[in-house]
């Protein structure tokens, strides 16, 4: 099939006092091979500080996956989610509050 770019969505949730979990989700993409990773101040986080979901079919002939990491509350602006897929790339910031979600579709 032809390339379908992902929709990228960054969310945040309370983890423990003073910490939040930030999750970067990519969905609706084809083919399956996608890079999704967190950066702090532009530097890649080590593998052992990130958690990945498997790349799974979403039932529409496309795929979905996610990556999450735990960060200190108040330091959200230092973190970005990086995505590479089929020759395209993008970076996505952490939303400033619980009610904000960032959705980006990339072509």
């Amino acid at each position: 099939g032809s390339t379908v770019p992902p929709m990228v969505n960054v969310t945040r949730s309370e983890a423990s006092e003073g910490n939040i979990t930030v999750t970067c989700r990519a969905s609706g993409f084809y083919p399956w091979n996608i890079t999704l990773s967190w950066r702090q101040d532009g530097v890649s986080l080590s593998h052992d500080t990130q958690q990945w979901g498997d790349v799974l079919p979403d039932g529409n002939g496309t795929y979905q996956t996610w990556v999450a990491t735990r960060i200190c509350q108040g330091e959200e602006q230092r973190f970005t989610c990086y995505m590479e897929h089929s020759g395209n790339h993008s970076t996505h910031p952490v939303p400033s509050g619980n009610s904000h979600h960032h959705h980006h579709h990339h072509h």
Epitope: R39, H47, D48, W52, Y82, E84, H85, G87
Partner: antibody, heavy 120, light 107 residues
Framework: QVQLKESGPGLVAPSQSLSITCTVS????????VNWVRQPPGKGLEWLGM???????DYNSALKSRLSISKDNSKSQIFLKMNSLQTDDTARYYC??????????????WGAGTTVTVSS | DIQMTQTTSSLSASLGDRVTISCSAS??????LNWYQQKPDGTVKLLIY???SLHSGVPSRFSGSGSGTDYSLTISNLEPEDIATYYC?????????FGGGTKVEIK
């Protein structure tokens, strides 16, 4: 097919700088990371750093002050620059494509390497 | 940095033998381990990624296993073209680090 080829000066004088070019084919630099790895004679492999599809770089902190990695997407070339070379920088320098898929991160295709000797 | 140790720097085996190469990490690396083969001419190839996944085009006689800090590469039926040095590499923490290598020779 995916290929990477390194080209370098061969010989560099101590305290001088090193510039190596990695020319790639079969894939786009805008959507792939490329790594630099070196191997001193008779020794093991050492990761130097990498450049991502968006041009962002990660470096081995032990060498970060002397290293610079850049690229030219239109020419399909990646550049390694290293300053203040000493004799223990004598090594074979490789570029390698990175595959970064969730829990699976690896260097799936390597160049043949270019030998750099630091000597006066 | 995480130290990777391959205690056997070289070994001799007969054609058809089962050969096992060991690698240990200075701390747990959660299966974030790859194996590479370097031929005498310096050519490097990926064999195994994420502890046990066989890279495409690699013969099925190669297999990987392990967990925690201890990992191994097995060649089930040694062939002449397997004469090479084998390196393990962790990517749990940055920078990625390699073991010192195990050279496999024919008896």
């Amino acid at each position: 097919q995916v290929q990477l080829k390194e080209s370098g000066p061969g010989l560099v004088a101590p305290s001088q700088s090193l510039s190596i070019t990695c020319t790639v084919s079969g894939f786009s630099l805008t959507g792939s990371g490329v790594n630099w790895v070196r191997q001193p004679p008779g020794k093991g492999l050492e990761w130097l750093g990498m450049i991502w599809g968006d041009g962002n770089t990660d470096y081995n902190s032990a060498l970060k002050s002397r290293l610079s990695i850049s690229k030219d997407n239109s020419k399909s070339q990646i550049f390694l620059k290293m300053n203040s070379l000493q004799t223990d920088d004598t090594a074979r320098y490789y570029c390698a494509r990175g595959a970064y898929y969730g829990k699976r991160w690896y260097f799936d295709v390597w160049g043949a390497g270019t030998t750099v000797t630091v000597s006066s | 940095d995480i130290q990777m140790t391959q205690t056997t720097s070289s070994l001799s085996a007969s054609l058809g033998d089962r050969v096992t190469i060991s690698c240990s990490a200075s701390q747990g690396i959660s299966n974030y381990l790859n194996w590479y083969q370097q031929k005498p001419d310096g050519t490097v190839k990926l064999l195994i990624y994420y502890t046990s996944s066989l890279h495409s085009g690699v013969p099925s006689r190669f297999s990987g296993s392990g967990s925690g800090t201890d990992y191994s590469l097995t060649i089930s039926n040694l062939e002449p073209e397997d004469i090479a040095t084998y390196y393990c590499q962790q990517y749990s923490k940055l920078p990625p680090t390699f073991g010192g290598g195990t050279k496999v020779e024919i008896k």
